[in-house]
Interface confidence: medium
């Protein structure tokens, strides 16, 4: 099995993690993709996933996580907005290919979120973010919550990430065609 590697991203609270996971265009363009968290000694857990089949450039939002799959470029864009210290952890992009094991897109993302100068939970005092409550929905989750932690034998291209400051944070009210999916049960 390929050795697992990590890329570390250190951000401040209130900032946005913007990760782009590359995949093999012809093979996986319409495959369902997911963003997962990995906890020590446990199976990866899916936090959000694209539709099945995955739609081109169609934003899917699960709380503060937004996924966009760009078929033309062979990349899955993952954004986690309004980052909080509690979001720190190890994450990965995967491609679902049932009945086979999910195909992991290297590298894993080690996210470290530290306090901004204002030290607020999920905010920076300079940020224009809104804290709001999304009403619960009964929509069925579109993706499996747990997947096997087995590694893949082929290492696709590395993921890349950009850091957005709170001032340049996206405004969620401007995201169109958003699907709200409760992925935790």
């Amino acid at each position: 099995a390929t050795k697992l590697t990590e890329e570390k991203y250190e951000l401040k609270e209130g900032q946005t993690l913007d990760v782009k996971c590359d995949y093999t265009l012809e093979k996986f363009a319409s495959s369902q993709k997911a963003w997962q968290i990995i906890r020590d000694g446990e199976m990866p857990k899916t936090l959000a996933c694209t539709e099945r089949p995955s739609k081109n450039s169609h934003p899917v939002q699960v709380g503060r996580i937004i996924l966009e799959d760009y078929h033309d470029h062979g990349l899955l864009r993952v954004r986690m907005v309004n980052l909080q210290v509690e979001d720190s952890g190890l994450y990965q992009c995967v491609i679902y290919q049932p009945p086979k094991e999910p195909h992991m897109l290297f590298d894993r993302i080690r996210l470290v979120v530290t306090k901004g100068f204002s030290g607020t939970p999920g905010s920076n005092e300079n940020s224009t973010q809104n804290v709001y409550k999304i009403p619960p929905t009964t929509t069925k989750a579109l993706c499996p919550l747990y997947t096997s932690p087995r590694t893949v034998t082929q290492a696709p291209p590395k993921s890349t990430a950009d850091v957005s400051t709170p001032d340049s944070e996206i405004n969620l009210t401007n995201v169109t065609d958003i699907i709200r999916v409760p992925v935790f049960n």
Partner: antibody
Framework: QVQLVQSGAEVKKPGSSVKVSCKAS????????ISWVRQAPGQGLEWMGS????????NYAQKFQGRVTITADESTSTAYMELSSLRSEDTAVYYC?????????????????WGQGTLVTVSS | DIQMTQSPSTLSASVGDRVTITCRAS??????LAWYQQKPGKAPKLLIY???SLESGVPSRFSGSGSGTEFTLTISSLQPDDFATYYC?????????FGGGTKVEIK
Amino acid sequence: QVQLVQSGAEVKKPGSSVKVSCKASGGTFSSYAISWVRQAPGQGLEWMGSIIPIFGTANYAQKFQGRVTITADESTSTAYMELSSLRSEDTAVYYCARSGGYSSSWYGTGYDYWGQGTLVTVSS
Amino acid sequence: DIQMTQSPSTLSASVGDRVTITCRASQSISSWLAWYQQKPGKAPKLLIYKASSLESGVPSRFSGSGSGTEFTLTISSLQPDDFATYYCQQFQSYPFTFGGGTKVEIK
């Protein structure tokens, strides 16, 4: 409708431990933060600590550090608070409360759901 | 730890009165403040979060304001159901401390 149901009242001896459970139903579990708050008879509210089940990590008030352990079992949607080396001053009603999540802020939206409370009496 | 100081500790008022409760933080907490109502033998109930956002289902006579270190909870016209104890709580940093409480009683 979201409900947090706590375990029943306990009577404990000084020096012993107590473990209170908080089972969530009617909603999600892992995507929220669960905190524990206690209230001694006739006193105010005191924050003890919290856990975000999906991350598995807990934060504790310094006052209880080393004596309290907060855990969560996602398979049963249950959070636990264990307090050790009990003394008479620990006699209180212990509440679990839910807040935030990926939809907004883990804690910034306050505790919107509370358990019914568990009375723990420490007496020799 | 951030200290939260509520005043007054007890407030006597009549139905229909406009009631204001103050909560002061020992350091700036931005807008990370919640207000709760608690009745004897019951769990607290969330009224306001992020200093001024009204929780769903809470009557509009309740409102919150302030930022930084000084916050207020206002009940525009006190109703019989409002006689209770009110607490503020900061979510700026761990531990998430509460104020000492304000008991609103019948005059």
